[in-house]
Structure formats: structure tokens, C-alpha cells
Amino acid sequence: ELCDDDPPEIPHATFKAMAYKEGTMLNCECKRGFRRIKSGSLYMLCTGNSSHSSWDNQCQCTSSATRNTTKQVTPQPEEQKERKTTEMQSPMQPVDQASLPGHCREPPPWENEATERIYHFVVGQMVYYQCVQGYRALHRGPAESVCKMTHGKTRWTQPQLICTGEMETSQFPGEEKPQASPEGRPESETSCLVTTTDFQIQTEMAATMETSIFTTEYQ
């Protein structure tokens, strides 16, 4: 039940999983000048039972020049995810009523890991998109994608998001930018996704979406 493809690529957006379904694999990749230790794992695997899920195996990198040094995993704050995860995320919340059993949290970084994480997702995984800094989103619906099994094949659903440059003024009919003032923000009928910490963004929808992007007045 591994997903055949990667989640959809949305120009100028990054995606992130809030948690990873059991069966997800994360490649043990090292940054340039480093390599996996000889007996090291090829990947970490999210495994678990009904009450607890965790990552099996540890990724360890050693200098390509050295023979015997092994580097231990050093837990740090939450890190970048597959395909350059955004800087827009806040730290994970502790386990609470919205946690998903059978899912692992983001694994802590290991020393000298590669800059990009490569995950192999499983059916049922949901990922969430945000526009990168300097781009805005126009909203029409949720900016999320799920890996589904349909007729024996896996596919990712299309997130309702596209990101446009901050300076671009093109908007869909009826769509307005969010205001700076706390009260009376105009509505953006084309559903949108988005954001980083403080700057505001909007986005347009791809014309290939399920419903016409010119309709956000939902009848």
C-alpha cells in the first residue's frame, strides 16, 4: 500500500504531513561529504501497535573521508520535510484529542542529514500545502492532498491551491486580498490556502479544479 507517486507538486508551495501513517519510510540521506555508516539503515520506518507508533531504525551519517566515526541522532526542533517543507510551521502540539493513532510524529533530525527529506508514503496519508514566502494563495477550498487507492492504483487528490507572486495583481472575479485590519476582512470566494508566520498571502486556483474557479458562490 505504498503510494506510487509523490504528492502533487504545486509551484511555489511546499507540503507537510502533520503525522506519518505506519508503513511510511524515510530515506537515510546524508549531506554532501557524508555517507551512511557501513552497517547503517537505509531508511527509518514508522511502525507501531494500537497504542504507540514510532520510527524504527536510526539514520547515521559519517564523513566520507573518515572510516570509523559514527554520528548520533541529535534531537532538535522540528525540521524540514520531504521536498523542502515550509518555514511557516509552528511546533507540533503535544499528543491530544486530535492526534492520530497509527501515525508517527516528524522524526528528529540526525547529524549531517541531507537538506531534503525523502519520504515514501502509504495509502491514506494526508499532506497539507502552504505557499512559500513571497507568494500568495487564493482560496477555494482546503489545501490538502490524500493518497488514495482507486481500482488497484494509488493516486493523490489535487489540493485546491495555486500560489502567485506577491507583486502579481491578477485575481479571480469576486476575490479580494485579505485586509490588514482585524475587522471586516473581505471574502475570498476562491478558496485558498496558505501562509507563513506573519505575512499574508492569497492564491489562485488551477482551472483544472473540480468546480469552475469562477464559481465560489456555492449553490
Partner: antibody, heavy 119, light 106 residues
Framework: QVQLKESGPGLVAPSQSLSITCTVS????????VYWVRQPPGKGLEWLGV???????TYNSTLKSRLTISKDNSKSQVFLKVNSLQTDDTAMYYC?????????????WGQGTLVTVSA | KIVLSQSPAILSASPGEKVTMTCRAS?????MHWYQQKPGSSPKPWIQ???NLAFGVPSRFSGSGSGTSYSLTISRVEAEDAATYYC?????????FGSGTKLEMK
């Protein structure tokens, strides 16, 4: 700990406006969307609208002309305003946060605030 | 507009029974979320994206479905499961809730 709490007037006269504040903690409004949902007594859930993390909004088309959703990220507050109230606007009003960024699964809910529209 | 029709509206079951409630969409959608609500309480997140159980949801619950038909199944009903269950989608516009299935104990 993620928390949302609605505060409203309780009783509102017909034709007046309703303003409800949702005060949140444990997360940033600039990162997650907040939805508004209401439930008339003894009835089902009705989606009112959403304010996305960037501050733009999407509304239920049947109520759109009467609704305004806004927020103040710095105060961690989201606001719902409903104009021209009628008796059938009597309901429990909930704000809810998504599980992931601008997602669609409402993973955290406030306790709700009951609004009665009556003369 | 996507309409979600839940059936049955009321479901009576005895403890230990297996029950299934259905949510049908008027057009094909990609996934379904579910919530549980008990009288006097806020809705609780129950199932995400068709089949992922929320934290604290007993493993006797499961979700499945595709296209226009989705279901929530309880393998062995317990008294504490008595509640109203709502389906919800926004994989196609607009956001919609189902009308709910009320599960009662016999």
C-alpha cells in the same frame, strides 16, 4: 494545549446583528484556519464559513450576504458577525480549528455559545 | 452542490452488535471525515480522510468507502457509543455536513 472558546451575547433581538468572538490558544492564527459552524436546537450541524490562515474567507453561499468573518492574529481572536437576525438563527455557535494548516478536518472545537434570537 | 445523505437517520442497536451507518454523496468525492456528538457537548473529531481514527477513538470503530458511498462501522457496539455521527466533506466544493445518524441503545 490547543483551545478555542466562543463568547457571545446570549440573547439578541430579531433584525439586530450578532457578534461572537472565538479566542484561541496553543496555536497561531497565521498558520491554521478557523471555521464557524452552528447547530439549531435538536438539529444538525451547519457550516457558516472559514477564515484561512492568510485572512481570506470562504462562506456558505446561502448565508453569505449576512456573514462577516475576520480575525486579529496578534490577539488570537476570530470574529463572526451575522446581520439581520431571524428567529431561525437561534443556535449553538461553534468555532473549530483544522488539524493541518488550511485543511478540512475540524480537529479542535470550542464548547460553543448559545445564541437565542427573540423579542 | 454536493449533498451528503446519511442513513439510517436513527439506528437502534444492542450492545455487542455490529452496526454500519452510511453517508452517500450526490457526486463522487475523494474522502470523508466523521464526527461524534453527544447531547450537550461539542462535536468530536472521529475519523479523518475516510479511515484514520482520531486519538481516543476505540479500535472497534472503522471507516471505509470511496466515490459516492462511505460508511462508519462499529464491530461491537457499546453503550458509550450512543451518539449522533456526522459525515463531512470538502474534497469537492462546497463544504458540507451530512444530516447525522443517531445511534441509540436498545
Amino acid at each position: 494545549q490547543v483551545q478555542l472558546k466562543e463568547s457571545g451575547p446570549g440573547l439578541v433581538a430579531p433584525s439586530q446583528s450578532l457578534s461572537i468572538t472565538c479566542t484561541v490558544s496553543g496555536f497561531s492564527l497565521s498558520t491554521y484556519s478557523v471555521y464557524w459552524v452552528r447547530q439549531p436546537p435538536g438539529k444538525g450541524l451547519e457550516w457558516l464559513g472559514v477564515i484561512w490562515s492568510d485572512g481570506s474567507t470562504t462562506y456558505n453561499s446561502t448565508l453569505k450576504s449576512r456573514l462577516t468573518i475576520s480575525k486579529d492574529n496578534s490577539k488570537s481572536q476570530v470574529f463572526l458577525k451575522v446581520n439581520s437576525l431571524q428567529t431561525d438563527d437561534t443556535a449553538m455557535y461553534y468555532c473549530a480549528r483544522t488539524y493541518g494548516y488550511d485543511g478540512s478536518w475540524l480537529a479542535y472545537w470550542g464548547q460553543g455559545t448559545l445564541v437565542t434570537v427573540s423579542a | 452542490k454536493i449533498v451528503l445523505s446519511q442513513s439510517p437517520a436513527i439506528l437502534s442497536a444492542s450492545p455487542g452488535e455490529k452496526v454500519t451507518m452510511t453517508c452517500r454523496a450526490s457526486s463522487s468525492i475523494s474522502y470523508m471525515h466523521w464526527y461524534q456528538q453527544k447531547p450537550g457537548s461539542s462535536p468530536k473529531p472521529w475519523i479523518q480522510a475516510t479511515s484514520n481514527l482520531a486519538f481516543g477513538v476505540p479500535s472497534r470503530f472503522s471507516g471505509s468507502g470511496s466515490g459516492t458511498s462511505y460508511s462508519l462501522t462499529i464491530s461491537r457496539v457499546e453503550a458509550e457509543d450512543a451518539a449522533t455521527y456526522y459525515c463531512q466533506q470538502w474534497s469537492s466544493n462546497p463544504f458540507t455536513f451530512g444530516s447525522g445518524t443517531k445511534l441509540e441503545m436498545k
